[in-house]
């Protein structure tokens, strides 16, 4: 990767981070009456998430994420869940590259939507701070 492509990657990661934080803030909104119900849904967590290729694991969970977000009141988000997830999917596909043979491995234990989002927020923050 060139310095310009790395800069683009950084910007995409920052966009991804903001989207994930927006979702988390939306579902954690004290006015969200569906939060208890949303927390009953389980998400698969990556066995490891340190590099861009591990975004394969996030991509595979975007459809379940959209389904859970559809439960929330739309006014908690600036965009409809379908559009929000579509935006994230575009970013993830660009970031993880075309290494289609790379298969995700998941941790043994599942997580709530809050734990899931926090994991990918941590991932995004760490890549932003260490990508050179």
């Amino acid at each position: 990767p060139t310095s310009s492509s790395t800069k683009k990657t950084q910007l995409q990661l920052e966009h991804l981070l903001l989207d994930l934080q927006m979702i988390l803030n939306g579902i954690n909104n004290y006015k969200n009456p569906k939060l208890t119900r949303m927390l009953t849904f389980k998400f698969y967590m990556p066995k490891k998430a340190t590099e861009l290729k591990h975004l394969q694991c996030l991509e595979e969970e975007l459809k379940p994420l959209e389904e859970v977000l559809n439960l929330a009141q739309s006014k908690n988000f600036h965009l409809r869940p379908r559009d929000l997830i579509s935006n994230i999917n575009v970013i993830v596909l660009e970031l993880k590259g075309s290494e289609t043979t790379f298969m995700c491995e998941y941790a043994d234990e599942t997580a709530t939507i809050v734990e899931f989002l926090n994991r990918w927020i941590t991932f995004s923050q760490s890549i932003i701070s260490t990508l050179t």
Epitope: M45, K48, E51, F102, F123
Partner: antibody, heavy 117, light 107 residues
């Protein structure tokens, strides 16, 4: 059998440069993330840099801007270009393979870098 | 950065004994923890991954456990060749960080 063999260490003056190499064999080199980890005399281990299979590079604040990790998949080789060296960079530098889903599973024997005037 | 703390720098044990080396993470790292053995004058050797899984060829005397923030490496029936320094490492997120190490001394 997986093998990692480092070379290129030596004595260098503060502010100088050095290029370390790591020759790999026994596995599909291009499919793995590789890392450099260092160990100062009598101290613990410190992660220095990593490069993934797409050649994206990662490093901590302590060396960013001074150290550059790179790879040549055709030669099954990993490199660490170290510039603006400081006394605190004195250490044994290890090349390690980062398994896709787990820890650093194979390590080289190390090469010693001494920064002193 | 995540700080990995091995509070005991040295541990003394006898051949045949059982000893546990502990490691604490400054934040939740799930089970993304590895353990390494470094014998004097040698490079580190991977023993444990995912907190509790042994690498191929590692004797079953070595057992890893823990999740979240507290981890341990237990060596049962200690042998003289276990004289080494043991390091934990988190690979939950970059930058990877290591514990300061625990030197095992054989009485």
């Amino acid at each position: 059998e997986v093998q990692l063999v480092e070379s290129g260490g030596g004595l260098v003056q503060p502010g100088g440069s050095l290029r370390l190499s790591c020759a790999a064999s026994g596995f599909t080199f291009s499919s793995y993330t590789l890392a450099w980890v260092r160990q100062a005399p009598g101290k613990g281990l410190e992660w220095v840099a990593a490069i993934d299979s797409s050649s994206y590079t990662y490093s901590p604040d302590t060396v960013r801007g001074r150290f550059t990790i790179s790879r040549d998949n055709a030669k099954n080789s990993l490199y660490l270009q170290m510039n603006s060296l400081r006394a605190e960079d004195t250490a044994v530098y290890y090349c390690a393979r980062d398994s896709n889903w787990d820890a650093l599973d194979y390590w080289g024997q190390g090469t010693t870098v001494t920064v002193s005037s | 950065d995540i700080v990995m703390t091995q509070s005991q720098k040295f541990m003394s044990t006898s051949v045949g004994d059982r000893v546990s080396v502990t490691c604490k993470a400054s934040q939740n790292v799930g089970t993304n923890v590895g353990w390494y053995q470094q014998k004097p004058g040698q490079s580190p050797k991977a023993l444990i991954y995912s907190a509790s899984f042994r690498y191929s060829g590692v004797p079953d005397r070595f057992t890893g456990s823990g999740s979240g923030t507290d981890f341990s490496l237990t060596i049962s029936n200690v042998k003289s060749e276990d004289l080494a320094e043991y390091f934990c490492q988190q690979y939950y997120t970059y930058p990877y960080t290591f514990g300061g190490g625990t030197k095992l001394e054989i009485k």
